[in-house]
């Protein structure tokens, strides 16, 4: 997960945009990525970076937990 997120974040050379990506990785079981992104007011660049990283992180976590279930862990 960390490697994949770092790969995405490396595209963003504006520090705030990069941090928007990292914010998207934080776990939040109560809201979807879209719901969280809707509260961002600093600009579309931040929304895009946040959403991309949030969705990727969610997918990777879901895949990992699915693998864990398959392995009976």
């Amino acid at each position: 997960l960390q490697e994949k997120i770092e790969e995405i974040a490396a595209k963003y050379k504006h520090l705030v945009v990069k941090k928007c990506c990292y914010d998207g990785v934080r776990i939040n079981h109560d809201e979807t990525c879209e719901q969280r992104a809707a509260r961002i007011s600093v600009g579309p660049r931040c929304v895009k970076a946040f959403t991309e990283c949030c969705v990727v992180a969610s997918q990777l976590r879901a895949n990992n937990s699915h693998k864990d279930l398959q392995l009976g862990r």
Partner: antibody, heavy 118, light 111 residues
């Protein structure tokens, strides 16, 4: 309407520090990044750094080698730029500006003249 | 850091004529089809004023005689026709990455 109002002119001795303020009004202060630029007499614009007041995130121009500190007071919608170890080459007009959409500077302060002289 | 090279450093134009200023970036300021290049006008004793954002978008209230074009590394600000009040310094600026950088400026004088 959006306004950025800066503090008044300063005259400082070499080696001292200066702190310039930038009071924002007419918009939600925490929604936009505030940048600081400077312009030496007869010269172009030099970017110094910025702060995102909502999160407190900052980034600085490495040319200033740790001499610059940018802070923000959300309660008064004011950003500050402090420059230490002043030298004569720091004599300039210092500007704050709002960055819209992480893309461009749409509003600027009126500028603060800082003169460094012994 | 992205270095922005403006040319010419100065130019004198007659009223009614066209003024063209170029800005060359040391690397592309295009990201996913969006060009993070802006243009500002600065008159003596005043702060800079936004003219053009995202390479070609005119800021509100800016006269239509100002236009911007270009993509990637090569950008142009055009004033056509030039008016007496356009006497000023003009700067390009990139916001793709930190540190934000400005071109060295172009001084436009009216003959």
């Amino acid at each position: 309407q959006v306004q950025l109002v800066q503090s008044g002119a300063e005259v400082k001795k070499p080696g001292s520090s200066v702190k310039v303020s930038c009071k924002a009004s007419g918009y939600t202060f925490t929604d936009h990044i505030i940048h600081w630029m400077r312009q030496a007499p007869g010269q172009g614009l030099e970017w110094m750094g910025y702060i995102y007041p909502r999160e407190g995130w900052t980034n600085y121009n490495e040319n200033f080698k740790g001499r610059v500190t940018i802070t923000a007071d959300k309660s008064t919608s004011t950003a500050y730029m402090e420059l230490s170890s002043l030298r004569s080459e720091d004599t300039a007009v210092y500007y704050c500006a709002r960055e819209r959409n992480l893309e461009y500077f749409d509003y600027w302060g009126q500028g603060t003249t800082v003169t460094v002289s012994s | 850091d992205i270095v922005l090279t403006q040319s010419p450093a100065s130019l004198a134009v007659s009223p009614g004529q066209r003024a063209t200023i170029t800005c060359k970036a040391s690397q592309s300021v295009d990201f996913e089809g969006f060009n993070y290049m802006n243009w500002y006008q600065q008159k003596p004793g005043q702060p800079p004023k936004l003219l053009i954002y995202a390479a070609s978008n005119l800021d509100s209230g800016v006269p239509a005689r100002f236009s911007g074009s270009g993509s990637g590394t090569d950008f142009t600000l055009t004033i056509n026709p030039v008016e007496a009040e356009d006497t000023a310094n003009y700067y390009c600026q990139q916001s793709l990455e930190d540190p934000h950088t400005f071109g060295g400026g172009t001084k436009v004088e009216i003959k």
